[in-house]
């Protein structure tokens, strides 16, 4: 439950559009060891690509790209009866406002691929 | 390349710790139709759970929980020779500072499960 039950939610229409944000991240080291090897051990393995943009915070975001169109079976062969697909998530990033070296940012939505999963294809019946 | 090549990166130590942020989201509707049915069609299917916190922005985040320990095979049976595991991602959220109805926020890191993937288990040989 909210600490301040009478406060407007930040998503409310009447909430101020500009707020102060402290960049000292809380939980900075929470689970920072999460670089697991799932990307290699998955039946829908993926590669990780570095997406860097100095005008954005965070400036580095890692994006997943599925290695295969199909999925890897128990023998290590690619089975095209199944498909590797990216799991995507919308995240919020801070985009520097386009005035020279300003300390003003704007929230921006980004769709990132986090990893891949193996799905049964949609079977389309042609009439 | 950056618009302002001489500007300090927002991750630099000498960057101001408090910045102004405009909450009018850019790319608000980017790919907003992405609610795919992968969670059902995956060999490592998952359920989506709503995580709500009015002191956070965004206040609602959906978290994935893998349905099975194993993975679903072509016949729809759970195969325990493989494991369903959550794909996790660190995201940034805004946490309202604990002063009554303040317009001050702090960046907070959250580890969220976005979906699940099917992996070969690590076999540990006991000496």
């Amino acid at each position: 439950s909210p600490q301040n039950p009478g406060c407007p939610n930040a998503e409310d229409k009447n909430f101020p559009r500009t707020v102060m944000v402290n960049l000292n991240i809380r939980n900075r080291n929470t689970n920072s060891k999460r670089a697991s090897d799932y990307y290699n051990r998955s039946s829908s393995p993926w590669n990780l690509h570095r997406n860097e943009d100095p005008e954005r915070y965070p400036s580095v975001i890692w994006e997943a790209k599925c290695r295969h169109l199909g999925c890897v079976d128990a023998d290590g062969n690619v089975d095209y009866h199944m498909n590797s697909v990216p799991i995507q998530q919308e995240i919020l990033v801070l985009r520097r406002e386009p005035r020279h070296c300003t300390n003003s940012f704007r929230l921006e939505k980004m769709l990132v691929s986090v990893g891949c999963t193996c799905v049964t294809p949609i079977v389309r019946h042609v009439a | 390349s950056p618009q302002n090549p001489g500007c300090p990166n927002a991750e630099d130590k000498n960057f101001p710790r408090t910045v102004m942020v405009n909450l009018n989201i850019r790319n608000r509707n980017t790919n907003s139709k992405r609610a795919s049915d992968y969670y059902n069609r995956s060999s490592s299917p998952w359920n989506l759970h709503r995580n709500e916190d009015p002191e956070r922005y965004p206040s609602v985040i959906w978290e994935a929980k893998c349905r099975h320990l194993g993975c679903v095979d072509a016949d729809g049976n759970v195969d325990y020779h493989m494991n369903s595991v959550p794909i996790q991602q660190e995201i940034l959220v805004l946490r309202r500072e604990p002063r009554h109805c303040t317009n001050s926020f702090r960046l907070e890191k959250m580890l969220v499960s976005v979906g699940c993937t099917c992996v070969t288990p690590i076999v540990r040989h006991v000496a």
Partner: nanobody, 125 residues
């Protein structure tokens, strides 16, 4: 938005080879699988080949497997279809296609949102 421009199509003798480049402009090129389709006169457009986002894997229609190879060069924003052992039945307009969604199939035409104008390949006997 992605613009696709195919080139490299021409008249070639049976048994010959061709390489068709497809140049893409737009930021989404590297984000999703790309595909090649073809349409012969009086026939429906059909899947030829597709390549994964990472470029590590490709899938082919049975009728070109072993003869055609798809590849991508993300630095050049280009996808290639390398065609060998060409047959007269390979005569068609070849289209490059990009997808902006990925819904668990790679050979279904409707999954591809962006198309080039096509390049004509004619194989004479």
């Amino acid at each position: 938005e992605v613009q696709l421009v195919e080139s490299g199509g021409r008249l070639v003798q049976a048994g010959g080879s061709l390489r068709l480049p497809c140049a893409a402009s737009g930021r989404t090129f590297t984000s999703y699988p790309m595909g090649w389709f073809r349409q012969a006169p009086g026939k429906e457009r059909e899947f030829v080949a597709a390549i994964s986002m990472s470029g590590d894997d490709a899938a082919y229609a049975d009728f070109v497997r072993g003869r055609f190879t798809i590849s991508r060069d993300d630095a050049r924003n280009t996808v290639y279809l390398h065609m060998t052992s060409l047959k007269p039945e390979d005569t068609a307009v070849y289209y490059c296609a990009a997808r902006t969604s990925y819904d668990g199939t790679y050979d279904y035409i409707d999954d591809y949102s962006y198309w080039g104008q096509g390049t004509q390949v004619t194989v004479s006997s």
